[in-house]
Each structure stands twice: as structure tokens, then as C-alpha cells.
Amino acid sequence: EEELQVIQPDKSISVAAGESATLHCTVTSLIPVGPIQWFRGAGPGRELIYNQKEGHFPRVTTVSDLTKRNNMDFSIRISNITPADAGTYYCVKFRKGSPDHVEFKSGAGTELSVRAKPSAPVVSGPAARATPQHTVSFTCESHGFSPRDITLKWFKNGNELSDFQTNVDPAGDSVSYSIHSTAKVVLTREDVHSQVICEVAHVTLQGDPLRGTANLSETIRVPPTLEVTQQPVRAENQVNVTCQVRKFYPQRLQLTWLENGNVSRTETASTLTENKDGTYNWMSWLLVNVSAHRDDVKLTCQVEHDGQPAVSKSHDLKVSAHPKEQGSNTAPGPALASAAPL
């Protein structure tokens, strides 16, 4: 009689993660008597995947009933495949012996490759806010995909970015891979409503790429512009001075009025007006009793925005003239050294 052959018809198979893999194996003879075992890998470090008679293999089922007298089909099905299951599987026939069974013949092996989807890309921006005209870095990470080939693109408001660097790890063979990309983005004053998008395309996604986004509102700080103006007031001895705080983001803002360098009032911004570009405006006013001052008054509007060093704008109020005559003199006074230019 012809010597037993172990036939593994599939040289390779590819399975999506989470699905089942069927590994085919048949033998051509019932002799010699002895069990079939399945291994992943070859040599002394090989991993036992299935033993016909003993061992705990909850993910493995046999395709046919191995207890049937003339059974020659030793195919197995492995459930819930993960990238860690990738490798070459060997169907091995053993001959009963003493003290241990003796390996008799092995199949040629079936290489199992696992297609695994990348995780949803996670985009993260800088730890601290940055102002317009500055360049900031965004990172995008996605993990657990296989095979290694993957495409990553960056977009800002739908426009593809070109200034980025991408790495796929590890460089050599692995059960699964990770991608890491860093993109550089130049901020503009209009970016409060902008989004940065990382798009990942992979064979497992069937043309429907995964996207991760970051809102530039989390990254940008738009410093305010200040304008101090004097308004005429009907009351004989009172002048209304306003401080217009314009085009700032985020909302966190504290304003202090100083009269000749002395703190007059401090207030936190509330009831803000939102601009179309996502920035905010706010106005504060100060009612100055002119009769309480003999000399000219230097009024300063000092603004601390989002924890940054204060910026200020001053206005010189002449007390010698009649308040109503001053109404036309609305030009702001000279800016202090720390003031933001208008």
C-alpha cells in the first residue's frame, strides 16, 4: 500500500479579523494508526493549535467527525481570528509509539494572513494654544491594522496638506501595524471654525476611509484689539469712556480700568457678541466724574486674555474743557508699550 501523505491544499489563505479561518487537511491512508495534530510554525518552538485527542482548544472545531471509522479529513476551523493568529499552520500525522507518539509526516503548511482594520484615527494638537501666523503640529495615530500597506492624508477645511511626515511601525514583519503622522499647520485669524482632518485608507475599509478630526478652536488663541473712545454725556460733570475689545478667542477675558494708574474697576467678560468667524467682541464702559479731578485724567483699559500678559490702551481725558465740547475728541490716546497694535 502507498505511504500516507498529508495534503494541505491551500498554500495560503487570507481572513478578516473577527471571522473564522478554515484550514484544510486530508490524509491518503488510515495507516499508520495515530493522531493528527495542528501546529503553527515549525521546529522546537512551534505552537500547538489542535490535538485530536487531548488539550483545551476552545476556538478550534473540526470540520468532520474525527471519530468516524474511515475519516481522512482533519480540517479545522479557528473562530474569532485576530492578527496574532497569522502564521504558517502545519497538519502533522503522528504514529502511536512508546513512550511518546512519533511524528510521522507533515503537510506542506498553509500560511494564514489576517486582514485587520485600523483603529479610528486619533488626532491630537499642541498642549498650549498658539496665535495666528504660528506653525503648530498635529499628530495622527491609528493601530492594529494588517497588512502593512496603508495611506494617510491630512486636510484643513477640505484642502489637502502637504507638510507632514508619516511612519508605519514596525519596519519588519509583524502580526499588526501602527501608523503615526505629524502635520504642520500655519494658523490664521480665521481658523476658530477650522478643522484638521487625518484620513486613513486601508484594504480592509473597502474604499470608505476612516477619519479623525481636531478642531482648531482647541488650539488657536486670537488676541484682542482694543479701542478706547470717549462719548459725550448729558450730565454736566460726567464723561462716558468705552473700551471696545474686538476679535478675540477664546472667551476667557478680564478687563481692568485704571485712572491715572490706579485700579478703578475690574470685570470679567460676559454677554459677548460672537462674530461670523467665531471670534468674540465685548465692550466695557466707564463713567468718569470730571468734577472729581482737578488735572487731566489718563484712563487705561487693561485686558488680560486667556491668561496671557495684559495688553492695554490709554486715553487722555482733559478736565479743563467742558465735557460736552470734548465729545468730538474721540481719537484714542497713545498706546502703551504693551498694547496690541490696531
Partner: antibody, heavy 114, light 108 residues
Amino acid sequence: EVQLQQSGVEVVQPGASVKLSCTASGFNIEAYYMHWVKQRTEQGLEWIGRIDPEDGESKYAPKFQGKATMTADTSSSTAYLQLSSLTSDDTAVYYCVRGSYEYWGQGTTLTVSS
Amino acid sequence: QIVLTQSPAIMSASPGEKVTLTCSASSSVSSSYLYWYQQKPGSSPKLWIYSTSNLASGVPPRFSGSGSGTSYSLTISSMQAEDAASYFCYQWSSYPYTFGGGTKLEIK
């Protein structure tokens, strides 16, 4: 549901023999080896041996060679462990275990006493 | 034959404490063939960990197993009262198959 039902308590005199049984249900006994394990009171576990019910082929730990004999009857889905020339050292709980290792019988308590 | 030595033989741990039980083999055991059992008084042993690191059905995730060659371990990340039991390692890499002497784990 997989079950291994073992025979009840045995009290036997020294020098005698005893045959313990383990009846399988919920699976085909020929599909797995059947193992036997000994546990003395408050002691560890000792592997006695295993049998392939399909053809009766068996392996024994050296310590139990000549002491234990394993057999199986596939028609009744029952595995047997015969222990001979009993001494007080054989007093123990004996378990049968399916080859997949997750199913154990409830154990048979054997007491050897005069 | 392969002798499996477990240490410590007896130990006690407080709730929440990390516990590591070791199993040392007199010669190399393939990781596929190293199993752990849990046994409580009056009950049959229960398969607890198979193929060195895989938890059997129903085993809490605070348990883990690791090792290779001649050195294996079972770890409980945070000891619970219900973990008090005896634990046995077992090899079926080569005949005769053997059990370790066991570790009796008590709760403080």
C-alpha cells in the same frame, strides 16, 4: 451537557483489588483520551495515566505501572480504573478527566482499611 | 520525568494585594502544554489557565499567566476573598504527565 459520572465511595480491605468507573455523557468517548488522577487527603494531584478509548492504547506514570490498569468500553461510554494489591497508600480520591482537561468527574473516594 | 516545583507551598495575601505563584520545571516545557488548575476544598479541580497564558471560561481577568521554558507563573493583580484556593500547575508536554505540588493561597 458534558458530564463524567464516577462510581460511589469504596471501602476495601488491604491486598484486595477495586475497579472504579467513569461514565461519560454529552460527548463521544472515542474522541478524547481519558485520564485518571489521584489525590490523597489534603495533598497534591498525581497523574496516574491515560487511555485512548478508541483502541485501548494507554500510558502510565512509572509509579502506577503494575498498580493501575485502565480500560474503556465504548458501547457504554465508560472508562475504568482497576487498582490491585491495595494498601493504605492507595487511600485517596480518584478523578477521571476528559482529554480536553476542562471536564472532571466528581471523584471516587477509596478507603483501604481492615 | 519532568518535575514541577511550585512556590511558595502556602501563602496568604490581603484583599487588593498583587499575588504571584511560580511553577518551575526540571526540564523545558513547551508553553502550549502548561496548564493551571484551581481547587477549593471538597470540589474537583477546575481548569484555570491553559497554554500558559489563556484564561479558561469564567476566570476573572485579574488572573494572568506567563512564562516559557522552565519558568512559569500565575499572577492575580488584585487578590479577592474568592481567590483563596489551591493552585496546581500541570504539564502534558511529555510522558509521564505531571502536576506541581500546589500552592495553597489564603486570604488575610
